[in-house]
């Protein structure tokens, strides 16, 4: 998990989240997303 401090004086936490593709479809493999401030953005 990476943590970045910004000039605004608060910290934004970045966390990689990994999901299995077959949980949401028929593909195999992993889906990697990025959660920033509690919201998955990718």
């Amino acid at each position: 998990d990476a943590e970045f401090r910004h000039d605004s004086g608060y910290e934004v936490h970045h966390q990689k989240l990994v999901f299995f593709a077959e949980d949401v479809g028929s593909n195999k493999g992993a889906i990697i997303g990025l959660m920033v401030g509690g919201v998955v953005i990718a």
């Epitope: 990994v18 299995f20 593709a21």
Partner: nanobody
């Protein structure tokens, strides 16, 4: 929820191998993605590897990629972690966990069932 019981830990020399097993009780085993985490003395519990419900998909932490292999046998309700080329830094208690489908498999909070852990010590 499933009950989990790990086995297979022990003392091994650097470069050696171990195979951990995690036996699950309950008819819902194949509803869960299964993962292995580990916790070294004085450190937090960290993700090691996970396998999908079908066993088709796997994912590994960078620190174990190419050395560890996770697999599952849904007929036996068991998950395995084959650990090769072991290093002293692999020393930890290894925990098996069950994560319901659709949850992130690399974070501890996704797992609602845990075993009691099995100790792996890599030392000469």
């Amino acid at each position: 929820e499933v009950q989990l019981l790990e086995s297979g830990g022990g003392l091994v020399q650097p470069g050696g191998s171990l195979r951990l097993s995690c036996a699950a009780s309950g008819r819902t085993f194949n509803n869960y993605n299964m993962g292995w985490f580990r916790q070294a003395p004085g450190k937090g519990r960290e993700f090691v590897a996970a396998v999908s419900r079908s066993g088709v998909s796997t994912y590994y932490a960078d620190s174990v990629k190419g050395r560890f292999t996770i697999s599952r046998d849904n007929a036996k309700n068991t998950v395995y972690l084959q650990m090769n080329s072991l290093r002293p830094e692999d020393t930890a208690i290894y925990y098996c966990g069950a994560a319901y489908r659709g949850t992130a498999i690399n974070v501890r909070r996704s797992y609602d069932s845990w075993g009691q852990g099995t100790l792996v010590t890599v030392s000469s």
